[in-house]
């Protein structure tokens, strides 16, 4: 048994980090592999993931990590058994993906404006709370080319759009996602996405 | 039965240096941490370092540069080594393993060290 | 450095009192409750009694207990049995592998 590709980790820097790896053949990851992983500033903690499958050769394992700070970093241990395939390290701090923003609303009766506004998935108190960015995406539910992309530049979340901008009478769909510029972070997953039907009507012209 | 289980104790002069052992059974030291702890003579408990699972060792900040912590996964025991001995070192020396939540969940009987001229 | 503070530093009870050892840290433990504690009796080595400040470690009679969080912590034994004379620590664990231990607590038959 051995890995075929190295396990890679990010975390959500509040108390979650996801590893995923590829093994060199079919695996049972829950009955055959365990991840172990160990806080290096307190090592007489020592914890224990049971990996889940990712397809045949893949394995998923979600690590939990309590009060995260940025010097914080983690011994990885990978077993089958008595045997140790991979020895690693990682640092949540240096490998973010922000969770995905939440409780997307989008409001129509604001006159001729469209608001959209959501939640940051971030308690007051976290380090990320103040340093998210994000992107909303919003597509014709019919057009799939009709789609385009806002990029919501100060932290505020919220987005204020013509309804004009759209086409009139079709149902649009949005979703957002979150990234942290200074943390280097990747982007977060999308939001799940919430619907809406464009009523606005163009305002008749006089000749 | 999982048990642990020092020795290398003795007698040394100041300036000296000494290898303890811890012999475990019924644990695996490569899945687990491992704590040397020491009292002196009529005293109270002192930690002196650690090893973890991974590896990874640290050490109580007056124990940093004179001890050293190892293990040798072959033959499942852990290791201190002592050097630059002094008086104050005299005591007895314990291996622990760590358990739940940093506790020290099971100890060693402890093997003595004196350093006297 | 960080303190772990034991009181009384010894006591003198009989069988059956209750009896209750305090602990208080200099700062808040991990977590607010990586706090142990342990009975030595002479010539042997330490048994864990209590971990993650109120759990009772296996096999260890019901009547000791421990509570308390951040920097203040308890053992009580409820009933002092003749077995039970012992000397007594608590130990913390902190971040930057620093695991402290109290200067022990001593309970003497009256």
């Known amino acids: 048994m051995k890995v075929l590709q190295e396990p890679t980790c990010v975390s959500d820097y509040i108390s979650l980090s996801t590893c995923e790896w590829k093994m060199g053949g079919p695996t049972n990851c829950s009955a055959e592999l365990r991840l172990v992983y160990q806080l290096v500033f307190l090592i007489s903690e020592t914890n224990m993931c049971v990996p889940e499958n990712n397809g045949a050769a893949g394995c998923v394992c979600h690590l939990f990590m309590e009060d995260m700070v940025g010097a914080d970093n983690y011994t990885l241990d990978l077993w089958a058994g008595q045997q140790l395939l991979w020895k690693g390290s990682f640092k949540p701090s240096e490998h973010v993906k922000p969770k995905a923003p939440e409780n997307l609303t989008v409001y129509t009766n604001v006159s001729e404006t469209l608001l959209l506004t959501w939640s940051n998935p971030y308690p007051p108190d976290n380090y990320l709370y103040e340093k998210l960015t994000y992107a909303v995406n919003i597509w014709n539910e019919n057009d799939p080319t009709d789609s385009r992309i806002y990029d919501v530049t100060y932290q505020e979340p919220t987005l204020r759009i013509a309804a004009s901008t759209l086409k009139s009478g079709v149902s649009y769909r949005a979703r957002v996602r979150a990234w942290a510029q200074s943390y280097n972070s990747t982007w977060s997953e999308w939001s799940p996405s919430t619907k809406w039907y464009n009523a606005y009507k163009e305002p008749f012209e006089k000749h | 039965e999982v048990q642990l289980v020092e020795s290398g104790g003795g007698l040394v002069q100041p300036g000296g240096s000494l290898r303890l052992s811890c012999a475990a059974s019924?644990?695996?030291?490569?899945?687990?941490?491992m704590s040397w702890v020491r009292q002196a003579p009529g005293k109270g408990l002192e930690w002196v370092g650690i090893?973890?699972?991974?590896?990874?060792?640290d050490y109580a900040s007056w124990a940093k540069g004179r001890f050293t912590i190892s293990r040798d996964n072959s033959k499942n025991t852990l290791y201190l080594q002592m050097n630059s001995l002094r008086a104050e070192d005299t005591a007895v020396y314990y291996c622990?393993?760590?358990?739940?939540?940093?506790?020290?969940?099971?100890w060693g009987q402890g093997t003595l060290v004196t350093v006297s001229s | 450095d960080i303190q772990m503070t034991q009181s009384p530093s010894s006591l003198s009870a009989s069988v059956g009192d209750r009896v209750t050892i305090t602990c208080r840290a200099s700062e808040s433990v991990y977590k607010n409750n990586r706090l142990s504690w342990y009975q030595q009796k002479p010539g042997k080595a330490p048994k864990l009694l209590i971990y993650e400040a109120s759990k009772v470690a296996s096999g260890v009679p019901s009547r000791f207990s421990g509570s308390g969080s951040g920097t203040d912590f308890t053992l009580t034994i409820s009933s002092l049995q003749p077995e039970d004379f012992a000397t007594y620590y608590c130990a913390g664990a902190y971040r930057g592998n620093i695991y402290p231990f109290g200067q022990g607590t001593k309970v003497e038959i009256k």
């Open positions: 090893i973890g699972s991974s590896g990874y060792m």
């Open positions: 019924g644990i695996d030291l490569r899945t687990n941490s």
């Open positions: 622990a393993r760590h358990g739940d939540s940093s506790s020290f969940a099971l």
